[in-house]
């Protein structure tokens, strides 16, 4: 990499103008950040604080329960995915402060921005696994009684993580550092070597596998679960179901802007005004997606407070109550009292 010293703020954010004024000192430039970048920085800061502390707490609470409680395994894995992504935030924050200058090298450029996509795939695959679990609890309680165990849950999580890593590879491979001549700046971004078809393919795969397909399948899944739950008028707690639905809903809400801008940019010419506008919003969309990394602990706390009536317990015990719930399945009227009682000891709540 060619050397230059970026410590001076004078280059800042210099806009290329065709208006010619030979008296203007061209190296002395405005150092103010754009509004979307400022908003992104605020979001990043909040997400980092809440995400690191919140997810660390969730990991601490669920790690002790993961041996015996399957729900704890699910929430532990979600928290690990979120916690990992939060670790990249100080670097991303620093880059935006420096007008997207990337002084951290090529390896960091490939790995750190890819963490949010790893989080996206890991989260949605884990949520799909959790949703399948909820579905089976409602519709196949006997199967759950016989086969649903911690070992199988860990295998499912391992498969989800493996697939997530596999799906993140394209982003990882195409990330490069580009050193621009003026203003002197190293940028970290994706480079498809002007191959628009490849760029579109990656964007479409990301949209379909990371958003549209999960949105469709999980909507159908939860429609069935909620209809069955309401039709049975289950008197027992639907705490976990409510929490999972909230987590799933937040996933799609916070990833929507990123996915929409991503697919649009892949179909636009890099020099077009719309592309440039979307590019200016890119950091904001990434930061909005990053809210996913801190929202889950907030959902758990809000859910815990709701279920407790008011916050009487300490935060760890409140989280433990929400995340490690042992539940009862009451899905078939033909079950005998003893069957229900046995299952109450063995399976998780809907």
């Amino acid at each position: 990499m060619d050397s230059f010293n970026y410590t001076t703020p004078d280059y800042g954010h210099y806009d290329d103008k065709d208006t010619l004024d030979l008296n203007t000192p061209v190296d002395k430039t405005s150092n103010t950040l754009r509004v979307p970048d400022i908003l992104a920085l605020v979001i990043f800061a909040v997400v980092f604080l809440v995400g690191v502390l919140g997810n660390a707490l969730v990991v601490w609470v669920t790690a002790f329960e993961a041996k015996r409680t399957i729900n704890a395994i699910w929430f532990l894995n979600l928290a690990v995915a979120d916690f990992l992504s939060c670790l990249a935030l100080p670097i991303l924050f620093t880059s935006i402060v420096q007008h997207h200058h990337w002084p951290f090298g090529g390896a960091a450029c490939s790995i750190l921005p890819s963490l949010i996509l790893l989080n996206m795939y890991a989260s949605i695959l884990l949520l799909a696994t959790i949703s399948a679990d909820r579905f089976l609890l409602v519709f196949k309680p006997i199967w759950c009684q016989n086969f649903r165990g911690a070992g199988l849950a860990w295998i499912a999580c391992a498969v989800a993580w493996g697939l997530a890593l596999l799906l993140t590879i394209p982003s990882f491979l195409y990330r490069v550092v580009r050193e621009e001549y003026f203003p002197p700046k190293v940028l970290c971004g994706v480079d498809y070597s002007h191959d628009k078809r490849r760029e579109r393919a990656v964007a479409i795969v990301r949209l379909v596998l990371g958003f549209l397909w999960p949105l469709l399948t999980l909507t159908i899944c939860y429609t069935f679960i909620l209809l069955r739950t309401w039709s049975r008028r289950a008197t027992r707690s639907t705490k976990t179901l409510k929490v999972v639905v909230a987590v799933v809903a937040s996933f799609f809400i916070f990833w929507l802007p990123y996915q929409v801008t991503g697919i649009m940019m892949s179909f636009l010419e890099p020099s077009s005004p719309t592309f440039l506008l979307l590019k200016k919003l890119d950091s904001l969309c990434v930061s909005f997606a990053y809210i996913n990394c801190c929202i889950n602990p907030i959902i758990y706390v809000v859910a815990g407070q709701g279920f407790q009536g008011r916050l009487r317990k300490s935060l760890p015990s409140l989280l433990r109550n929400v995340l490690t719930e042992e539940s009862v399945v009451r899905e078939s009227k033909s079950f005998t009292r003893s069957t229900v009682d046995t299952m109450a000891q063995k399976t998780q709540a809907v």
Epitope: T8, Y11, K17, V26, D27, P184
Partner: antibody, heavy 119, light 112 residues
């Protein structure tokens, strides 16, 4: 009117250093940077480096360890120093300045300094 | 580094004919600000290169309108609609989007 005038030795012995001065007029060195470029039959036109108006430098990675660019704003002079010369450093050396901004570099060129590296 | 490939190496033309020189870059030259920093220079024998066209299609001061530049991304073209004697020399394309700025190998425009 922008002008760049170069001065420096024509013949340099191998392993010695090359020093070229570029004196500019028509613009201020505090506002505009100056680039150095060389041209040889073997390598064509090759960018060496730049010194920005604010004083920062940027060098071609292939020459970074041997190259140094500095300036004297008050005398409107830019200096190129290339150490440990080899025969393949034989080339015509140019200083160049931008048009309006560094987004349009190498708009104005010096007359060139022919440097021959030979014992 | 970005490799700039110019074709043809030599272009024999008759005065008054149209000439077309192609330049291809190994990477996209679109800057993060949306502009493309691809420039064209002419070097006459014994002289320093002179800027003709900057940012793909903008003519530098005093350049006749028979010169035009076009292209995007990685493929660019310089056209001279009616070649005159004073146009002869070696034409270079150059990019200043990325570090280091790089130049094409040159195209020699000569009389047929």
């Amino acid at each position: 009117q922008v002008q760049l005038k170069q001065s420096g030795p024509g013949l340099v012995a191998p392993s010695q250093s090359l020093s070229i001065t570029c004196t500019v007029s028509g613009f201020s060195l505090t506002s505009y940077g100056v680039d150095w470029i060389r041209q040889s039959p073997g390598k064509g036109l090759e960018w060496l480096g730049v010194i920005w108006g604010v004083g920062g430098t940027n060098y071609n990675s292939a020459l970074k360890s041997r190259l140094s660019i500095s300036k004297d704003n008050s005398r409107s002079q830019v200096f190129l120093k290339l150490n440990s010369l080899q025969t393949d450093d034989t080339a015509m050396y140019y200083c160049a300045s931008p048009y309006y901004s560094h987004y349009v570099p190498f708009a104005y060129w010096g007359q060139g300094t022919l440097v021959t590296v030979s014992a | 580094d970005v490799v700039m490939t110019q074709t043809p190496l030599s272009l024999p033309v008759s005065l008054g004919d149209q000439a077309s020189i192609s330049c291809r870059s190994s990477q996209s030259l679109v800057h993060s600000n949306g502009n493309t920093y691809l420039h064209w220079y002419l070097q006459k024998p014994g002289q320093s290169p002179k800027l003709l066209i900057y940012k793909v299609s903008n003519r530098f001061s005093g350049l006749p309108d028979r010169f035009s530049g076009s292209g995007s991304g990685t493929d660019f073209t310089l056209k001279i609609s009616r070649v005159e004697a004073e146009d002869l020399g070696v034409y270079f394309c150059s990019q200043s989007t990325l570090v280091p700025p790089t130049f094409g190998g040159g195209t020699k425009l000569e009389i047929k």
